[in-house]
């Protein structure tokens, strides 16, 4: 009967592809009259079609080169694999999709480069003291974590311009302290001072030789100096088989793109390297500070991780940077920066905890979509990243290529890669929207009314001005009795009213809205629903009369995602558990369960057994999550320390268990009207007496 | 059409490098990863390996590791392959070629530079 | 590296004839298997990617068939301008490679 490849009208094989990936083409020159070339391939067989003449491309996936992936990071660096396989070959067919996977392993013993880049302004001074001997307190750490540890140092300030510097009076151009009755360095924009070393004293000493500037204003340029710090890695000595971390320590703001104009600095930051032999940055007065967009793209390119310590008055504000910087983690430095240590190591187990998958150089005709297979093998549709594991862990990620219509380029390639790893999936993209049998065409061929077109595919394509299967009818011999094969039934209108019929073929109008198509001009790409004003939500193509949905898009408007990232709570699941992920928005389902990803529940039976852990974590210091370093992300909740329990009403749920040393603990969960949730904890846990 | 224009011959003495490059017209350069093939008489063909000029993303034949460098400038739609440290096993026609990702065909080459190192 | 063998190192055959040159692989290549021609000039073309499917623009009496190990090119009606060397290559598995040519003469 009639499907999708039998009532498109089209003419030729590669028109014939292009309708669905269900249609095949025969171009068998002996298939029976008035039997559809562009049908699907079990009836073009049913026709007689001989199979070698039926063109039918399927698409398909290929791995070309799959190393395994690595146990230890130690060895031969350039042997370790974290990420297989590492490259494949798609075929893809116009409008089809390929599936193809990729594993993650987070290896053990991995070596790892430590960059800290330090304001040293000078507001910085008590914490350029506690740091001096951090190299090798950071060594004795990191020793648990891996065997090959480098660390290097660079400071910054600003840009030694007004109105950034002192520059009145004349001494406080040499000395920017002097009218503080003390002495203080010169200021200077970014200088790296110690290339990545295993020799982790050389970190103290050169620390110990360091002073602090002063700039003039509040922001400071860190950003200059983390993008230097970045892009000059052979000054840093940053390592291609390494993990990078770049720390960054202020306790100011920073100064970003278009503050430079401030100074009449005008041109761009050009994301290059100008450290010269000095060490000191050499376009600091001439190039603007860096975009967060550039910053972004030069640490990616550098797979580094960036670690903002910074001070509480300015931690919300490196929070928003953080979350448009993929793979970038934030501390808060104490006052004199004596919980740096910690802090890094925190941030690193946060770094080693997460993988999360980036995509590079896209084709805008192609769309991913993900399904993240992390722990407990369960497939979490949608989500492009895996948190909560351990070094050593393996998480696969299943993805799906779809290619919009037939791109212009037939090559393309892409790079999938988890963020901050030098280890990476190419992806090489052939797009199959031709056949084969086109290599054989016969220009100007006799079986075309003697030369009025190619035989190609077992049909003629007719020169200008011809028409007809056999290219017999001149455009300009119009005869009305043809008339009845340009509509679909006796009545209907001829060629949909969109068209003129000639020599009983349908020459479809040209419209300033789109194309229209067909064998009875009765398709277009214009008339799809529109929803909020744009065609397919602006999430697919219309495609006569129906919306083709983008990936990660679904639905009759196409304006539902299929994307569940926005339904991950921070324990890790889906609607916290209670829910389903609908459109990319939690329906909560379990009684009584509220908020964005239905986390919050007072009265649900597990509130006291996961409300626990955060007691333990963030009263006690100790427990599950404790161990893991995890606490504040999974605990965001206030706790409050109490003599005894008041009756805080129905929202309020009170809680008992046994603790490691057999004492009974009791709190109350709570949350308040503005959503904020509070844990009361009884100050003093119950114990046993012991024996009199 | 598509063409790849290849520099013209070199004679060059041991120990030196040269640098041989591989014009693309015809195709969007940038898309297609280019391959370097070396030809011995009597050795055959040797894939040395392939750049994708849209990002720089370079792979090497292990045998010509740290003898081949592979550049790319977009903007002249220009292909470089570098041959460092040459001897007379160096000696060689070298060509560029466009490919086929997915049949890992090459579909157009270039005509060949050959290379000379003699003292 | 998968090995790739032109036993027949050269070939003797008269216009008109029909010309077969094989290739062997030392392992299973699934079918992605490459023929090219290099002229005497040196200039070198794609004649038929994928075991069987033809380039554009190269002429029909070029065929090619095979599967798993064993591949082979035909050249139904061999022409004074088909004079060449024919190599073939794998694309199964990185690196490709080779086979050492096959020099088609004319008797």
């Known amino acids: 009967g009639p499907n999708i490849c039998t009532t498109r009208g089209v003419s030729s094989c590669q028109q014939c592809l292009a309708v669905s990936p269900m249609c095949a083409w025969c171009s068998d020159e002996a298939l029976p009259l008035g039997s559809p070339r562009c049908d699907l391939k079990e009836n073009l067989l049913k026709d007689n079609c001989a199979p070698e003449s039926i063109e039918f491309p399927v698409s398909e996936a290929r791995v070309l080169e799959d190393r395994p992936l690595s146990d230890k990071g130690s060895g031969d660096s350039s042997q370790v694999t974290q990420v297989s396989p590492q490259r494949i070959a798609l075929r893809l067919r116009p409008d089809d999709s390929k599936n193809f996977s990729i594993q993650v392993r987070q290896v053990e013993d991995y070596p790892v480069d430590i960059y800290y880049l330090m304001d040293l302004s000078y507001s910085m001074k008590d914490d350029l003291w506690s740091i001096q001997n951090l190299g090798t307190k950071l060594a004795t750490q990191m020793r648990k974590l891996t065997s090959n540890l480098r660390i290097g140092f660079g400071a910054f300030v600003d840009k030694p311009v007004s109105p950034y510097m002192y520059i009145s009076p004349p001494e406080a151009l040499e000395n920017p302290c002097y009218d503080m009755k003390t002495t203080c360095l010169p200021m200077f924009g970014y200088k790296h001072v110690l290339t990545l070393t295993d020799q982790v004293t050389r970190f103290n000493e050169e620390v110990k030789k360091q002073s602090v500037s002063r700039n003039r204003d509040a922001p400071e340029g860190g950003f200059d100096a983390i993008m230097q710090a970045t892009v000059c890695d052979e000054k840093i000595g940053w390592r291609n088989d390494a993990s990078h971390l770049l720390v960054f320590t202020t306790d100011a703001k920073t100064h970003i793109a278009l503050d430079g104009r401030l100074a009449g600095i005008v041109q761009p930051n050009d994301g290059q390297c100008h450290v010269g032999s000095d060490n000191h940055y050499s376009a600091s007065t001439t190039m603007d500070y860096p975009s967060l967009g550039l910053m972004t793209e030069k640490l990616s390119q550098k797979n580094i991780n960036l670690i903002f310590a910074v001070t509480e008055n300015v931690v919300n504000l490196y929070q928003n940077y953080s979350e448009l910087i993929p793979g970038t983690t934030v501390g808060v430095l104490s006052m004199d920066s004596s919980n740096v240590l910690q802090l890094i190591v925190d941030a690193y187990g946060k770094i080693r905890s997460k993988v999360e998958l980036e995509v590079r150089d896209l084709p805008e005709e192609l769309s991913l979509s993900f399904n993240a297979t992390c722990l407990n093998n369960e497939v979490i549709p949608g989500l492009k990243s895996c948190m909560g594991l351990k070094i050593g862990d393996t998480v696969s990620f299943s993805i799906e290529a779809k290619v919009r219509g037939c791109p212009q380029e037939k090559e393309k390639s892409f790079t999938i890669k988890p963020v901050g790893f030098k280890d990476s999936l190419i992806v090489q993209v052939t797009f199959d929207c031709d056949c084969a049998c086109q290599a054989q065409a016969e220009p100007n061929s006799h079986r075309c009314n003697n030369g009025n077109g190619t035989f190609e595919c077992g049909v003629c394509r007719c020169g200008p001005g011809w028409l007809g299967s056999q290219c017999e009818c001149s455009e300009e011999d119009y005869r009305p009795s043809q008339q009845d094969e340009c509509s679909p039934r006796e009545g209907q209108p001829v060629c949909s009213q969109r068209g003129e019929c000639l020599c009983g073929q349908c020459v479809c109008h040209s419209s300033d809205f789109g194309k229209i198509t067909g064998k009875y001009c009765e398709c277009d790409d214009f008339s799809c629903v529109r929803y909020k004003g744009e065609m397919c939500s602006g999430h697919g193509q219309c495609s006569c009369g129906d919306c083709l949905c983008d990936s990660d898009w679904t639905g009759y408007y196409c304006n539902c995602t299929t994307r569940t990232d926005t339904c991950m709570s921070s324990n890790g699941l889906l609607c916290s558990g209670r829910g389903k992920c609908e459109c990319g928005s939690c329906v909560c389902i379990q009684p009584g369960s509220y908020g964005d990803t239905c986390e919050k529940c007072p009265t649900c039976p597990d509130a006291c057994t996961f409300k626990k852990e955060c007691v333990e974590c963030k009263k006690f210091d100790r427990g599950a999550l404790h161990d893991e370093n995890t606490c504040n992300r999974y605990c965001r909740d206030e706790i409050e320390s109490v003599k005894e329990l008041k009756d805080t009403g129905k929202d309020a749920v009170n809680c008992t268990y046994k603790n490691e040393d057999d004492c009974v603990v009791r709190f109350q969960y709570y949350e308040d009207s503005s959503g904020k949730s509070i844990l009361y904890v009884v100050e003093e846990p119950e114990c046993p007496k012991g024996p009199d | 059409q598509v063409q790849l224009q290849q520099s013209g011959a070199e004679l060059t003495k041991p120990g030196a490098s040269v640098k041989i490059s591989c014009k693309a017209t015809g195709y969007t350069f940038s898309s297609y990863w280019i391959e370097w093939v070396k030809q011995r008489p009597g050795h055959g063909l040797e894939w040395i390996g392939e750049i994708l000029p849209g990002s720089g993303i370079t792979k090497y034949n292990d045998k010509f590791k740290g003898k081949a460098t592979f550049t790319a400038d977009t903007s002249s739609n220009t292909a470089y392959m570098q041959l460092s440290s040459l001897t007379s096993e160096d000696s060689a026609v070298y060509s560029c070629?466009?490919?086929?990702?997915?049949?890992?065909?090459?579909?157009?080459w270039g005509q060949g530079t050959s290379v000379t190192v003699s003292s | 590296d998968i090995q790739m063998t032109q036993t027949t190192s050269s070939l003797s055959a008269s216009l008109g004839d029909r010309v077969t040159i094989s290739c062997r692989a030392s392992?299973?290549?699934?079918?992605?298997l490459n023929w090219y021609q290099q002229k005497p000039d040196g200039t070198v073309k794609l004649l038929i990617y994928y075991t069987s499917r033809l380039h554009s623009g190269v002429p029909s009496r070029f065929s090619g068939s095979g599967s798993g190990t064993d591949y082979s090119l035909t050249i139904s009606n061999l022409e004074q301008e088909d004079i060449a060397t024919y190599f073939c290559q794998q694309g199964n598995t990185l690196p490709p490679t080779f086979g050492g040519g096959t020099k088609l003469e004319i008797k």
């Open positions: 070629a466009r490919l086929i990702s997915y049949y890992y065909a090459m579909d157009y």
């Open positions: 392992q299973d290549i699934s079918n992605y």
